[in-house]
């Protein structure tokens, strides 16, 4: 089943995207795009990081995890409607056709109107991991909060060892994540 | 307006090296892939290769161990160099644009050269 | 390698009919967002290959809407609604999920 990633009109979005370097330092270039992966790099990139550095990044698009330990995550500030669509994390490990590529559908959703005058907190500070199943039933919010007792590798052996699992799908959708080395 | 074009030999001789040339116009070979697809005498397309805007290559698995492919971006040249060839290489060689989208794969070609590898 | 295999291999038509064209994949060619990388190609007679749909249903740019793909996971299919007497050639189904890509036999369109 397709895992959407959804927000509202005026929020900051959020979609997850992992490795786990091989070594700490040992980063991996990875290219973030507008638009399903392409057979190879990303098309219409709004953001790269190559072994050292964030190297080209646009307005709005920023990596708010640390894309030093492979959490390459994106944030898209102040979304619109027109940010919906699919969106391409691509993993570029060296070596003969290695890459890994995720394709990432995010919904935007018109901003709901509040009677209260209370301030709304950001949305990436609120739910820092948050993403939507589409199961049987109404759709369910998870919020994974910031992982603090599962590293990265955990995650991508329990989504390896689980992957046709809905617990997988959740995992492996909620990071997105692959191991190198 | 885009175009490529191919030029090269049209007959090579067998164990020999095939060494073709790609000339573009109306895009630069830093923002767009190109690459090599081929059609033997009356067969379908095989995909030979491609280079990435950043300069990547990624071979057919077939023929990984024969092929190379370069570009010269200040001559918007690219080209394919086939090692130890046989009659089996005889073909059509396009030469494509990879529109670096989903939707622009392999969406001009050049018109084609007839190579013949033959004694 | 992902091996792609077409039915029929040529097939004749008249003029305004419909044709069909089947396309079936060794491998899903559908990923977890719902995105199939399948694509459909025309070769006409004397000429390159051209492209005609990308991700299975996406009409490439410049085609007729007589065109339409459909399908997902292993299975699709090339509709053309009323044949023309242009689109005479060989089609091509192709997959672009996984390196090396690779394409199905062709299916040669006459018209009769």
């Known amino acids: 089943s397709e895992v959407e990633y959804r927000a509202e009109v005026g929020q900051n979005a959020y979609l997850p995207c992992f490795y786990t370097p091989a070594a700490p330092g040992n980063l991996v270039p990875v290219c973030w795009g507008k638009g399903a992966c392409p057979v190879f790099e990303c098309g219409n990139v709004v953001l790269r990081t190559d072994e050292r550095d964030v190297n080209y990044w646009t307005s709005r698009y920023w990596l708010n995890g640390d894309f030093r330990k492979g959490d390459v995550s994106l944030t898209i500030e102040n979304v619109t409607l027109a940010d919906s669509g699919i969106y391409c994390c691509r993993i570029q490990i060296p070596g003969i056709m290695n890459d890994e590529k995720f394709n990432l559908k995010l919904v935007i959703k018109p901003a709901k109107v509040t009677p209260a005058p209370t301030r709304q907190r950001d949305f990436t500070a609120a739910f820092p991991r948050m993403l939507t199943t589409r199961g049987h039933g109404p759709a369910e919010t998870q919020t994974l909060g910031s992982l603090p007792d599962i590293n990265l590798t955990q995650i991508s052996t329990l989504a390896n060892e689980l992957r046709d699992s809905r617990l997988a799908n959740d995992l492996r959708d909620s990071g997105a994540t692959i191991r190198i080395g | 307006q885009v175009q490529l074009q191919e030029s090269g030999p049209g007959l090579v001789k067998p164990s020999e090296t095939l060494s073709l040339t790609c000339t573009v116009s109306?895009?630069?070979?830093?923002?767009?892939?190109v690459g090599w697809i081929r059609q033997p005498p009356g067969k379908g397309l095989e995909w030979i290769g491609i280079?990435?805007?950043?300069?990547?290559?990624y071979y057919n698995s077939a023929l990984r161990a024969r092929v190379t492919i370069n570009r010269d971006t200040s001559k918007n040249q690219f080209s394919l160099k086939l090692s130890s060839v046989t009659a089996a290489d005889t073909a059509v060689y396009y030469c494509t644009r990879d529109g670096t989208t989903v939707e622009t794969l392999f969406d001009y070609w050049g018109q084609g050269t007839m190579v013949t590898v033959s004694s | 390698d992902i091996v792609m295999t077409q039915t029929p291999l040529s097939l004749s038509v008249t003029p305004g009919q419909p044709a069909s064209i089947s396309c079936r994949s060794s491998?899903?060619?559908?990923?977890?967002?719902?995105?199939?990388?399948l694509y459909w190609y025309l070769q006409k007679p004397g000429q390159s290959p051209q492209l005609l749909i990308y991700l299975a249903s996406n009409l490439g740019s410049g085609v007729p809407d007589r065109f339409s793909g459909s399908g997902s996971g292993t299975d699709f299919t090339l509709k053309i609604s009323r044949v023309e007497a242009e689109d005479v050639g060989v089609y091509y189904c192709?997959?672009?999920?996984?390196?090396?890509?690779?394409f199905g036999q062709g299916t040669k369109l006459e018209i009769k």
């Open positions: 491998q899903s060619l559908s990923d977890s967002a719902g995105i199939t990388y």
């Open positions: 280079m990435t805007s950043g300069g990547s290559t």
């Open positions: 109306g895009f630069s070979l830093t923002n767009y892939g």
């Open positions: 192709m997959q672009g999920i996984h390196v090396p890509l690779t």
